[in-house]
Amino acid sequence: AGVFELQIHSFGPGPGPGAPRSPCSARLPCRLFFRVCLKPGLSEEAAESPCALGAALSARGPVYTEQPGAPAPDLPLPDGLLQVPFRDAWPGTFSFIIETWREELGDQIGGPAWSLLARVAGRRRLAAGGPWARDIQRAGAWELRFSYRARCEPPAVGTACTRLCRPRSAPSRCGPGLRPCAPLEDECEAPLVCRAGCSPEHGFCEQPGECRCLEGWTGPLCTVPVSTSSCLSPRGPSSATTGCLVPGPGPCDGNPCANGGSCSETPRSFECTCPRGFYGLRCEVSGVTCADGPCFNGGLCVGGADPDSAYICHCPPGFQGSNCEKRVDRCSLQPCRNGGLCLDLGHALRCRCRAGFAGPRCEHDLDDCAGRACANGGTCVEGGGAHRCSCALGFGGRDCRERADPCAARPCAHGGRCYAHFSGLVCACAPGYMGARCEFPVHPDGASALPAAPPGLRPGDPQRYL
């Protein structure tokens, strides 16, 4: 475990003609902040691992207002470091993206507005515990100067933060084969469990389970002297003791390739294979153009005809990010309508529709009533992907095939008795009640709350519900 630290020194116009306009004005004061995104060395290609090593956001810088007529100076910066903690081993080679953001502080409706001013990216080799490394990167007409380092968090030490330190067991010195932990001289390296059988004299390990050989030794367990395994490919001075040629310094020793380039020997010299955004004999020249293919996942690069003009990436469906490096979960946008199941196939989006719906996004409601008949004079009603029958009086069920019992719901109030009738139901009311459902009490003086009963019907007679 450890922390990657980034110190921004300056952000302002780069050298040469075409100085950029100040990003802030009297009408629109603004302030800067920065974002850093880190990925392990090879993950630049991997869309599924955006900022896999971590990311950090700086504080906001001081508010800046452009002086009319003055060229854009170096802009005021936020205080402090950007710190990206990493939990596992430091990978040694890493990719970074540093973005400079502008926060406009004018009278924006709904709060401040943010816009990306510049973005730089690169790949570097860096050992943890080393000194600050300085860098200058250009993005269009802007120039960013910064330093960075990786440091281990105790008890971890080493170039990859994989060795552990423990307090000394004895006051004077560490145990056999264990070094003091610089800079924690009062602590000792904790022994690592190397690969089983790894030579204790000629091998060592920086991570559990590995076996790395000291100079002059080789083999999976560092038990084979280099002199016996190198006679087939002689190079360099002869060994006086074995009479065999021991490899001398090769053109790739010390890796002459900068910025994470990988070295391969050629008959005359060496050749560097440079990471994206770097070129030159030793990958020492920086500056990304569209011809470098900075857009991942087939993205279209626009602009960036030369190293001093910024490029933008137009991403294929399913990808986003400044370099199309992030895979989008397009199903999270719930594109399938009417309860359809979303399937993101990577190159396309598919919707598996529920019964009764169709179309690329399940947007078409199929004619649910087509070919469906409702019996006994019922009418078909569409909706929700399933047909429904509105049944004629006296019938029920899905297709109106069942004769309904109109008395099942106990429609007669106040103890009235219900009788099924060909045209509906009839309520025989209990004494003291009247009405189609026996809902009205009869007044004690014989008058009812209703208008006079129709001729031929006395209060208390069964009232037929028409």
Epitope: E45, G293, G299, L300, P316, H347
Partner: antibody, heavy 117, light 107 residues
């Protein structure tokens, strides 16, 4: 300057085979998806297939009309992409273009394939 | 596969006139439509991407519009070098497909 140069076209009998090459210069070839697109005489454009990057395990995709007959490969060290065409049919007669990316930004000048008995 | 239908098949116009080309998709393709220009004996060249964005180096007289299923390429004032065949292509769904083309010829 970006240049894509196709070669390998020619006259071949139905059922025969042909291998097309596309050599790229002026770009970091290994960072680009590569496609083959064809155009039958007096007809429109038809995407044939695609090969992605080493980091994508050189994944390939093909149009249904050529699946099982055509194979795309690439040699990043030579900045070259290939189209191996087997079991050729008369309807494969076309000008074949190589093109880059998902959006076909850079195009070659094309090479003509004629399948005829 | 998504089908793109271009109209008209041929457009006869004079230099200086405005050209309006149409492209209809068989289903919603968002704004993932590009326009390509092809002159006789030459390879196609990307003009417009994302339905309305001009590609690097393309003159401002070319503009694109539309989203969903209906797209338009407009050449505001035809130059002699603009007489060519124009294709629309969709990149919403894999595989990419092209329209049949519109030939812009000199009247």
């Amino acid at each position: 300057e970006v240049q894509l140069v196709e070669s390998g076209g020619g006259l071949v009998k139905p059922g025969g085979s042909l291998r097309l090459s596309c050599a790229a210069s002026g770009i970091t070839f290994s960072n680009f998806w590569m496609n083959w697109v064809r155009q039958a005489p007096e007809k429109g454009l038809e995407w044939v297939g695609q090969i992605r990057l080493k980091s994508d395990q050189y994944a390939t995709h093909y149009a249904e009309s050529v699946k099982g007959r055509f194979t795309i490969s690439r040699e990043d060290s030579k900045n070259t992409v290939y189209l191996q065409m087997n079991s050729l049919k008369t309807e494969d007669t076309a000008v074949y273009y190589c093109t880059t990316g998902y959006y076909f930004d850079y195009w070659g000048q094309g090479t003509t394939v004629t399948v005829s008995s | 596969n998504i089908v793109l239908t271009q109209s008209p098949a041929t457009l006869s116009l004079s230099p200086g006139e405005r050209a309006t080309l149409s492209c209809k998709a068989s289903e919603n393709v968002g704004t993932y439509v590009s326009w390509f220009q092809q002159k006789p004996g030459q390879s196609p060249r990307l003009l417009i991407y994302g339905a309305s964005n001009r590609y690097t180096g393309i003159p401002a007289r070319f503009s694109g519009s539309g989203s969903g299923t209906d797209f338009t390429l407009t050449i505001s004032s035809l130059e002699p070098e603009d007489f060519a065949v124009y294709y629309c292509g969709q990149f919403y769904s894999f595989p990419s497909t092209f329209g049949g083309g519109t030939k812009v010829e000199i009247k």
